[in-house]
Interface confidence: low
C-alpha cells in the first residue's frame, strides 16, 4: 500500500538536488582558493540536516546553523550588491566588476541558488514531488528560512556603503515583501553602514523618467533615514550600456548618463 | 564494496593511441574525483591528471598536456585515460585511484586504486 | 610544479626496529600530504592522508607528521609485511606530485 504523502502546492525538490549541491561546493571551492578549507561532504552532511525528517513546515534558522558555521565566509564589507527583482543583471555586474559581491557570489548563495528542496517528517526521503508554497501553505519552509538567515547574515556583514539594484519595470520598485524589503533592509548596521545606494534599472529603451521619485523608493529612503543610514538613489537608464562602460570605462561614451 | 577495475593489458605501436578504463563500483553517490597515475617499469609513480565525473572537468600535468584525454560516463560510472602519439617510453603501468577531498584544484587523497593495466609500445 | 624530496633513497631496518621516512617539499603544502606504500606487482596503497590521519585499516604502528614543507612517516615497530616502497605526494597545488620514494628493506 503507497504510503500517504503530504501534497504541496509549491515543486517538489529540485532534481538531482544532492549532486548539484555538491558539485556546485566543489566548483565553488576550485575558483575561490581562500574556500579550499571547506569540506564539500561536511557541507552537504550539514545542509542535509537541516531540513531531513523535519516537517517542511516547521523549519527554523537554528537548523540551519551547522551549514552557516561551515560555510562562514569573509567578504569585504564595503563591496556588498545588494538586489531585489533583478537577479540576473546583479550576477552579471559582479561577474564584471570582480571586487564587489552579491549573496549568491558567496559560497552558500551559490549553493542554493534556483534550487528548490524540502524533506519529510520522519522520513529520511527528499520530496521530489512538491514542496510547500511560502503563500500557499508556510512560509517556515526550507527554502523561505534559508534565504532569510543568509539574507540576514549577509546584510549584516555590510559595510561604509552599500548598494542595491532595483527593477524600475515592476509596479512596487521597493517591495517591503522582497527579501530585500523585509530582511536586508532591517539588518543593515547603523554603526557600520554609512549609506545604502540604489541603483533603479530601468526597462524601456525611451524612459527617461526619474524613478528615483517613484513613492516606493521614498518609502526605502524614509525606512532607511530612520534607521540612521543615509539613503542615495541613482537611475540606471541604459542597463546593457551601463554593463558594457563597467567593462571599458575608458570608453568615450561612457562619459554620459547611462 | 568499493572498487575500481581497469582494461586488461595492451601492445601498441609508436604513433598510436591507447585507451584504458576504469569502472568504478559501490562508490558513494558524491563528487568525488577520478585520477590517474602512470609507474615506468622500475620507475616511480607520476600524476598524469584527473576527471571528476559530477562535473565533467578534467585537469592535466603539462607534460602530458595535449596528448592525454580523461574523460567518464557517468551512466556507467566508467573513467576512460586515452593517450595518443605513443613512444615507448610510454611502457608503463597505467593506474585509476578514487580521489576523495571534495576539492577541485587540491586536497584530493586517493584511497582506492585500480590494479594497473600494463601498456606496452613496441614497434 | 612542487618537488617532493624523500630520504633516505633506501632504508634498511630489522623487524622490530622504527622507521623514520622524511619528505620535503619544494614550498608549502599546508597538511596536504599523503604517504602510499608500495608493494612489487601492487597497486600502491594509502596509509596517511592530511600529513597525520590514518587511512581506513591502517595500523596504529604506522604515524604522519609535519605540515608546510617538512613531513614524516614513522613506522614504531617493522613487521614483515612493511617492506615496501613508500612515497609521499602533495596535493596542495595542482599538478599533485610524488617524492621520489624510499625503500624500507630487511636488515
Known amino acids: 500500500v503507497p504510503r500517504w504523502r503530504q501534497q504541496w502546492s509549491g515543486p517538489g525538490t529540485t532534481k538531482r538536488f544532492p549532486e548539484t549541491v555538491l558539485a556546485r561546493c566543489v566548483k565553488y571551492t576550485e575558483i575561490h582558493p581562500e574556500m579550499r578549507h571547506v569540506d564539500c561532504q561536511s557541507v552537504w552532511d550539514a545542509f542535509k540536516g537541516a531540513f531531513i525528517s523535519k516537517h517542511p513546515c516547521n523549519i527554523t534558522e537554528e537548523d540551519y546553523q551547522p551549514l552557516m558555521k561551515l560555510g562562514t565566509q569573509t567578504v569585504p564589507c564595503n563591496k556588498i550588491l545588494l538586489w531585489s527583482r533583478i537577479k540576473d543583471l546583479a550576477h552579471q555586474f559582479t561577474q564584471v566588476q570582480r571586487d564587489m559581491f552579491t549573496l549568491e557570489d558567496t559560497l552558500l548563495g551559490y549553493l542554493a541558488d534556483d534550487l528548490t528542496w524540502c524533506g519529510e517528517f520522519n522520513t529520511s526521503k527528499i520530496n521530489y514531488q512538491s514542496c510547500p508554497d511560502w503563500r500557499k501553505d508556510c512560509s517556515n519552509n526550507p527554502v523561505s528560512v534559508f534565504w532569510k538567515t543568509v539574507s540576514r547574515r549577509f546584510a549584516e556583514a555590510a559595510c561604509d556603503v552599500v548598494h542595491v539594484m532595483l527593477n524600475g519595470s515592476r509596479s512596487k520598485i521597493f517591495d517591503k515583501n522582497s527579501t530585500f524589503g523585509s530582511v536586508e533592509v532591517h539588518n543593515l548596521q547603523p554603526e557600520k553602514v554609512q549609506t545604502l545606494e540604489a541603483w533603479v534599472i530601468h526597462g524601456g529603451r525611451e524612459d527617461s523618467r526619474d524613478l528615483c521619485q517613484d513613492p516606493t523608493i521614498k518609502e526605502l529612503e524614509s525606512i532607511i533615514s530612520k534607521r540612521n543610514i543615509q539613503f542615495s538613489c541613482k537611475n540606471i537608464y541604459r542597463p546593457d550600456k551601463f554593463l558594457q562602460c563597467v567593462k571599458n570605462p575608458e570608453d568615450s561614451s561612457c562619459t554620459s548618463e547611462i | 564494496q568499493v572498487q575500481l577495475v581497469q582494461s586488461g593489458a595492451e601492445v601498441k605501436k609508436p604513433g598510436s593511441s591507447v585507451k584504458v578504463s576504469c569502472k568504478a563500483s559501490?562508490?558513494?553517490?558524491?563528487?568525488?574525483?577520478i585520477g590517474w597515475v602512470r609507474q615506468a617499469p622500475g620507475q616511480g609513480l607520476e600524476w598524469m591528471g584527473r576527471?571528476?565525473?559530477?562535473?565533467?572537468?578534467?585537469h592535466y600535468a603539462q607534460k602530458f598536456q595535449g596528448r592525454v584525454t580523461i574523460t567518464a560516463d557517468e551512466s556507467t560510472s566508467t573513467a576512460y585515460m586515452e593517450l595518443s602519439s605513443l613512444r615507448s617510453e610510454d611502457t608503463a603501468v597505467y593506474y585509476c585511484?578514487?580521489?576523495?577531498?571534495?576539492?577541485?584544484?587540491?586536497?584530493?587523497?586517493?584511497?582506492?586504486w585500480g590494479q594497473g593495466t600494463l601498456v606496452t609500445v613496441s614497434s | 610544479e612542487i618537488v617532493m624530496t624523500q630520504s633516505p633513497a633506501t632504508l634498511s631496518v630489522s623487524p622490530g626496529e622504527r622507521a623514520t621516512l622524511s619528505c620535503r617539499a619544494s614550498?608549502?603544502?599546508?597538511?596536504?600530504l599523503a604517504w602510499y606504500q608500495q608493494k612489487p606487482g601492487q597497486a600502491p596503497r594509502l596509509l596517511i592522508y592530511?600529513?597525520?590521519t590514518r587511512a581506513t585499516g591502517i595500523p596504529a604502528r604506522f604515524s604522519g607528521s609535519g605540515s608546510g614543507t617538512e613531513f614524516t612517516l614513522t613506522i614504531s615497530s617493522l613487521q614483515s609485511e612493511d617492506f615496501a616502497v613508500y612515497y609521499c605526494?602533495?596535493?596542495?597545488?595542482?599538478?599533485?606530485?610524488f617524492g621520489q620514494g624510499t625503500k624500507v628493506e630487511i636488515k
Open positions: 585511484a578514487r580521489g576523495l577531498g571534495y576539492y577541485l584544484y587540491s586536497s584530493y587523497y586517493f584511497d582506492i
Open positions: 605526494q602533495q596535493y596542495n597545488n595542482w599538478p599533485w606530485t
Open positions: 592530511g600529513a597525520s
Open positions: 559501490g562508490l558513494p553517490d558524491a563528487t568525488y574525483a
Open positions: 614550498q608549502s603544502v599546508s597538511s596536504n
Open positions: 576527471i571528476i565525473p559530477v562535473l565533467d572537468a578534467a
